[in-house]
């Protein structure tokens, strides 16, 4: 029996009965917030073999092992994850072992096992046999391994029953509990699953099977399940659903889920039955079940009940996220804010059409309107008094409307009005008239030439770069010395630079009047010698990184009532030189025979250029005699193996502790202080833990139904 669409068991342990007949949970399984310790021994769900999304356990008092509850849980598919995790075990006060001895595969996602004060048998499970990648697993804050004394079946009797694998250079027995080994299939099966008797399953099986080489005997399917058979792809006239089974069109047409209730129903696209058309596609008609590609960004019509939408904060802008057509009027009134330009672009950057008018007033935080980066049409179906459909009043820091070289904007009906924008040059307004097709509509007073641009250098000369030199982390640039009509009007230069992977940045990207700026700024004084060209050394840059750079002359902006000339350069794109890459990450080695080592690693986080090859070096190490000095059959503390560099975690040593040796000197001294990198890593770790815990609480604490 398939159960769905996600089962949430909380408060009352008797709700577990809902799992009685489930073989597959199509969705997630939450078991949480059961504060009264209960006896779970009478609850057993041997039919449950697959969870298609994730398993979350949180604060279930009295539960000591999952093995009795779910003895046959074999696969967690992770089709949807809980904060990147397919298995979350968090704050389970009484859990002593996980015990999911039949769990063979977590198809997608990692595991997070945290703050379980009594939980052991974590180091005895080889998660690499269950998951593709173990690097994202997070197993922290559980019972310390040295207090666990985890022993696999038969170890005490010197008749070990479990198989061994290597984890972190430790070759050891693998088990889930004192009496349950971790199942491993014969190497002859390769990536295939196997039966309890170690016979290889059909290639389409996942996890396990009841008979060898039979695609109808699988416990779970590697790809898709249809009519009792595991198939590599869904047969004709059936469609992939929830990442694991094939359904027909009728099933897909009739789905009414709580998640999709507001939509127009599920769609069939690319052989899959899904909730919505994927990114870049739109329904072929409002009630269609099929998707067609969008031309440009997919349209999303947003409407304001009150006709006029006031954008006075990031929160109000957030309501327009994804909108491409706004039915109504936009009133932008941004007086202050943090990182406002990029936030507005994030939420309003897709708007292409406004059916009414656009009014920008008292928006002292704005330097540019480029956050409306896709606006191409203002219809002006509704206009302000005086027939204005674009109205810009009293914006103290507005310097740019849009980059008119890369912008087509049409104002279909209505006039423009500009007043009291002291940093907005009139030439910029006239350019907008040309582009938008409104030239001739405005009357004389609609564009005020006195109070627009009164505090700006409105006629710019072009500064030309004369030389550029690069190294791995430095750029040296020089430019022509700028000579305004009166040399006293030139104060200094400002160099702006930032990382620019693509050659598509503009001067006003991410810039607002409240201090946020995606550009780094450096002031450059005038060279005292009039014959020397001004220049700068930019240092502390990243190797093999493209930067955008431009220079502005800082000039006195007003000489009585005359506008004076300013100067700035074009944007220059320049790449630093390549450098030595950082170290490869997550180096793992394992032996698969007496004469071979398999070494795996991930690429360096900072390649600092184009990687062409890796160098692998190895050397033979003497066998460590220390390993033979301990009776491994005793249940005492078992020492951790020494690492290659010779350091040991003192707490793990069972003999007389030695004082830690620090630096090059022999003899006692304090523990070495943590490096900045270590402190930063710890800080990030703590932050990450908080973020996860907040996510967990926000996800699971919900108002009581009815």
């Amino acid at each position: 029996e398939i159960c769905g669409p996600g089962i949430d068991i909380r408060n009352d342990y008797q709700q577990l009965k809902r799992l009685e007949n489930c073989t597959v949970i199509e969705g997630y399984l939450h078991i949480l917030l059961i504060s009264k310790a209960e006896d779970y021994r009478s609850y057993r769900f041997p039919k449950l073999t697959v969870i298609t999304e994730y398993l979350l356990l949180f604060r279930v008092a009295g539960l000591e092992s999952l093995g009795d509850l779910f003895p046959n849980l074999t696969v967690i598919r992770g089709w949807k994850l809980f904060y990147n995790y397919a298995l979350v075990i968090f704050e389970m006060t009484n859990l002593k072992d996980i015990g999911l001895y039949n769990l063979r595969n977590i198809t997608r996602g990692a595991i997070r096992i945290e703050k379980n004060a009594d939980l052991c048998y974590l180091s005895t499970v080889d998660w690499s046999l269950i998951l593709d990648a173990v690097s994202n697993n997070y197993i922290v804050g559980n019972k310390p391994p040295k207090e666990c004394g985890d022993l696999c079946p038969g170890t005490m009797e010197e008749k070990p029953m479990c198989e061994k694998t290597t984890i972190n250079n430790e070759y050891n027995y693998r088990c889930w509990t004192t009496n349950r080994c971790q199942k491993m299939c014969p190497s002859t099966c390769g990536k295939r699953a196997c039966t309890e008797n170690n016979e290889c399953c059909h290639p389409e099986c996942l996890g396990s099977c009841s008979a060898p080489d039979n695609d109808t005997a699988c416990v779970a399917c590697r790809h898709y399940y249809y009519a009792g058979v595991c198939v590599p792809a869904c047969p004709p006239n059936t469609y992939r659903f929830e990442g694991w089974r094939c359904v027909d069109r009728d099933f897909c047409a009739n789905i009414l889920s709580a998640e999709s209730s507001d939509s127009e129903g599920f769609v069939i696209h690319d052989g899959e039955c899904m909730q919505e058309c994927p990114s870049g596609f739109i329904r072929n008609g409002s009630q269609s079940m099929y998707c067609i590609p969008c031309e440009g960004p997919c349209p999303k019509v947003c409407e304001e009940e009150k006709k006029t939408k006031t954008i006075d904060s990031v929160t109000s802008a957030q309501m327009l996220q994804g909108c491409t057509i706004f039915k109504g009027n936009l009133l932008i009134n941004i007086r202050r804010g943090n990182n406002i330009a990029s936030e507005l672009e994030n939420f309003m950057g897709l708007i292409e059409v406004v059916t009414g008018y656009v009014k920008i007033r008292h928006s002292h935080a704005l330097v540019s309107l480029s956050f409306l980066k896709n606006l191409r049409l203002i219809l002006g179906e509704e206009q302000l008094e005086g027939n204005y459909s674009f109205y810009v009043l009293d914006n103290q820091n507005l310097q740019q409307l849009w980059d008119w070289d890369h912008r087509n904007l049409t104002i279909k009906a209505g006039k423009m009005y500009f007043a009291f924008n002291p940093k907005l040059c009139v030439s910029e307004i006239y350019r907008m008239e040309e582009v938008t097709g409104t030239k001739g509509r405005q009357s004389k007073g609609d564009i005020n030439t006195r109070n627009n641009g009164e505090r700006a250098s409105c006629e710019s000369d072009v500064l030309h770069f004369t030389s550029t030199t690069t190294s791995k982390n430095r750029i040296i640039i020089t430019w022509h010395r700028y000579r305004p009509p009166d040399y006293r009007d030139l104060i200094s230069f400002t160099v702006y630079y930032k990382e620019a992977p693509f050659k598509n940045v503009t001067e006003y990207d991410g810039q607002d009047a409240c201090g946020s700026n995606s550009w780094n700024m450096v002031d450059v004084d005038l060279p005292p010698n009039k014959d020397v060209e001004p220049g700068i050394l930019l240092h502390g840059l990243k190797p093999w990184t493209q930067y955008a750079v431009y220079v502005k002359a800082v000039t006195l902006t007003m000489v009585e009532n005359d506008h004076i000339r300013g100067a700035k350069s074009e944007i220059l794109y320049i790449r630093t030189n390549a450098s030595v890459p950082s170290i490869p990450l997550d180096v793992l080695s394992a032996s698969n025979s007496s004469s071979q080592l398999i070494v795996k690693w991930n690429p360096p986080s900072l390649p600092n250029g184009n990687l062409s090859y890796y160098i692998v070096r190895w050397q033979r190490q003497p066998q460590d005699g220390y390993l033979y000095r301990h009776n491994y059959c005793s249940k005492d503390k078992i020492p951790i193996r020494k690492y290659a560099d010779g350091t040991i975690d003192i707490e793990e040593v069972t003999e007389n502790p030695k004082t830690e040796v620090c630096g090059g000197e022999k003899g006692p001294c304090c523990a070495c202080p943590k490096t900045e990198a270590e402190k930063q890593a710890e800080k990030e770790e703590a932050e990450y833990r908080k973020v996860f815990e907040n996510f967990l609480h926000n996800s699971i604490f919900v108002p009581r139904p009815e």
């Epitope: 029996e1 769905g4 089962i7 789905i255 209730s261 409002s286 139904p705 009815e706």
Partner: antibody, heavy 117, light 112 residues
Framework: QVQLQESGPGLVKPSETLSLTCTVS?????????WNWIRQPPGKGLEWIGY???????NYKPSLKDRVTISRDTSKNQFSLKLSSVTAADTAVYYC??????????WGQGTLVTVSS | DIVMTQSPLSLPVTPGEPASISCRSS???????????LQWYLQKPGQSPQLLIY???NRLYGVPDRFSGSGSGTDFTLKISRVEAEDVGVYYC?????????FGQGTKVEIK
């Protein structure tokens, strides 16, 4: 895989309240769909009574609205029908059924309720 | 309420022969979203109803292709191209476009 099972007394006295429960297995009633009651008097046609949706909202047949209540118990994954002030005309086989975006896809097997003193 | 009127109420048929059932609504059952939620259900003796056709003409997966639905607005038809013995039972049309949802009174198909 989804199963619906009606349960309740087979005999109700006139003027009393008819109470039936539909137990759903294989799908959470809060996860989606509309959970309906439909009846069929002996030898007659089908009559839709009303539904409770996954979010708890109701819709009833107007002519029965004053007498009918459909509620749910999410912890037991059940929904219920209460029909007050019953008469002999309410004698019928009562079905619970799941309705999706378009059609009824799963039905219970039906339970006969007789109104008689 | 929208009244769904079926005809005939009884339909004796010979196996292998075609059959046709009409269903007429008292007003248009086109939903505001443009869809027409007209279904046909078959109730075999002693069983719960089962779906045959949804949204006027979409045959449910697994229903034999001898069943077909057609119509629009207020007039709808279910056709069986060649009746078989297993097709006996009561056929109901149903509209789910406007609340309250309503069934037709049923057409009993029996073998002559």
């Amino acid at each position: 895989q989804v199963q619906l099972q009606e349960s309740g007394p087979g005999l109700v006295k006139p003027s009393e309240t008819l109470s039936l429960t539909c137990t759903v297995s294989g799908y959470s009633i809060t996860g989606g769909y509309l959970w309906n009651w439909i009846r069929q008097p002996p030898g007659k046609g089908l009559e839709w009574i009303g539904y409770i949706s996954y979010d708890g909202t109701n819709n009833y047949k107007p002519s029965l609205k004053d007498r009918v209540t459909i509620s749910r118990d999410t912890s037991k994954n059940q929904f219920s029908l209460k029909l007050s002030s019953v008469t002999a005309a309410d004698t019928a086989v009562y079905y619970c059924a799941r309705h999706g975006r378009v059609f009824f896809d799963y039905w219970g097997q039906g339970t006969l309720v007789t109104v008689s003193s | 309420d929208i009244v769904m009127t079926q005809s005939p109420l009884s339909l004796p048929v010979t196996p292998g022969e075609p059959a046709s059932i009409s269903c007429r609504s008292s007003q248009s059952i086109v939903h505001s979203n443009g869809n027409t939620y007209l279904q046909w259900y078959l109730q075999k003796p002693g069983q719960s109803p089962q779906l045959l056709i949804y949204k006027v003409s979409n045959r449910l997966y697994g229903v034999p292709d001898r069943f077909s639905g057609s119509g629009s607005g207020t007039d709808f038809t279910l056709k069986i191209s060649r009746v078989e013995a297993e097709d006996v039972g009561v056929y109901y049309c149903f509209q789910g476009s406007h609340v309250p949802w309503t069934f037709g009174q049923g057409t009993k198909v029996e073998i002559k």
